[in-house]
């Protein structure tokens, strides 16, 4: 059950997809990736208030228990629900090759 | 790539499975669940320091960017990697039924 998409904290404050520009140096990839030189990293950032984009029953339980025991149980967390593949040109022992990574760029987000 | 399981913050401080005892009232289930009266909720709690139980490439990127831009990019988060099913006896219009939920109890944890 993917619950409400209305953010009670105000526009853009809740769990959603953000894009962060990063260089190969930022990512620690400069020694093994040739291209792209810069990556538009899509990631999930934002708060997960009660039932906002709850991924499943576990997330709903976590919300309930966080309300009761905030020092013991953390609130649900904003994480990728799915990914977009990304292609890198990487250095190999024999030259270069195209490599597709399935789990690199977040495609959409939920709270869990 | 599931990275190191050694916690640099000290024993038990990093992302791992915890059990939290909760009543039906705690969970807000008293009106639709008959049994069990109490649930041993397994959930993922703890810090995700650099590369600890990194679920995938996205988690590794998040670690790198959090180090560079801690105010913009959050650290990876401790979430379920898989679930154990749980059976509930729930009230229905016609009586009671057994219902299995696949996404209720965390089985193991990783950082993402």
């Amino acid at each position: 059950a993917r619950n409400g998409d209305h953010c009670p904290l105000g526009p853009g404050r809740c769990c959603r997809l953000h894009t962060v520009r990063a260089s190969l140096e930022d990512l620690g990839w400069a020694d093994w990736v040739l291209s792209p030189r810069e990556v538009q990293v899509t990631m999930c950032i934002g708060a997960c208030p009660s039932q906002f984009r709850a991924a499943n029953m576990h997330a709903q339980i976590k919300t309930s228990l966080h309300r009761l025991k905030p020092d013991t149980v953390p609130a649900p967390c904003c994480v990728p629900a799915s990914y977009n593949p990304m292609v890198l040109i990487q250095k190999t022992d024999t030259g270069v090759s195209l490599q597709t990574y399935d789990d690199l760029l977040a495609k959409d987000c939920h709270c869990i | 790539a599931r990275n190191g399981d050694h916690c640099p913050l000290g024993p038990g401080r990093c992302c791992r499975l915890h059990t939290v005892r909760a009543s039906l009232e705690d969970l807000g289930w008293a009106d639709w669940v008959l049994s069990p009266r109490e649930v041993q909720v397994t959930m993922c709690i703890g810090a995700c320091p650099s590369q600890f139980r990194a679920a995938n490439m996205h988690a590794q990127i998040k670690t790198s960017l959090h180090r560079l831009k801690p105010d913009t990019v959050p650290a990876p988060c401790c979430v379920p990697a898989s679930y154990n099913p749980m059976v509930l006896i729930q009230k229905t219009d016609t009586g009671v039924s057994l219902q299995t939920y696949d996404d209720l109890l965390a089985k193991d944890c990783h950082c993402i």
Partner: nanobody
Framework: QVQLVESGGGLVQPGGSLRLACAAS????????VGWFRQAPGKNPEGVSC????????YYADSVKGRFTISRDNAKNTVYLQMNSLKPGDTAVYYC???????????????RGQGTQVTVSS
């Protein structure tokens, strides 16, 4: 209308060859890098090959290196993928896409065709 159209797919026996074409209309392809992707049923898309716009540098996935060759014919506004020594594992829908530079990205490319089916089976 700006579009890419793939052709040349079909059914071929293991060890056989096919030449796929990616023809552009509505824009000049020589200003763009062109990538070929494939997607097998139930699997994620995979980058297969890319040819840059600037110097014609070609890049290949390890799984096709030495068997596939990418080339461009600017006069025909077309990029080709010559596929030799085909294997059952090459069975997929093949797409082409254009972007400013290699590697062309699956999620963010400027234009993409509808694909052409390649089936390798005896």
């Amino acid at each position: 209308q700006v579009q890419l159209v793939e052709s040349g797919g079909g059914l071929v026996q293991p060890g056989g060859s096919l030449r796929l074409a990616c023809a552009a209309s509505g824009f000049t392809l020589d200003a763009y890098a062109v990538g070929w992707f494939r997607q097998a049923p139930g699997k994620n898309p995979e980058g297969v090959s890319c040819i840059s716009s600037s110097d014609g540098s070609a890049y290949y996935a390890d799984s096709v290196k030495g068997r596939f060759t990418i080339s461009r014919d600017n006069a025909k506004n077309t990029v080709y993928l010559q596929m030799n020594s085909l294997k059952p594992g090459d069975t997929a829908v093949y797409y082409c896409a254009a972007d400013l530079s290699c590697p062309v990205q699956i999620a963010t490319f400027h234009s993409r065709g509808q694909g052409t089916q390649v089936t390798v089976s005896s």
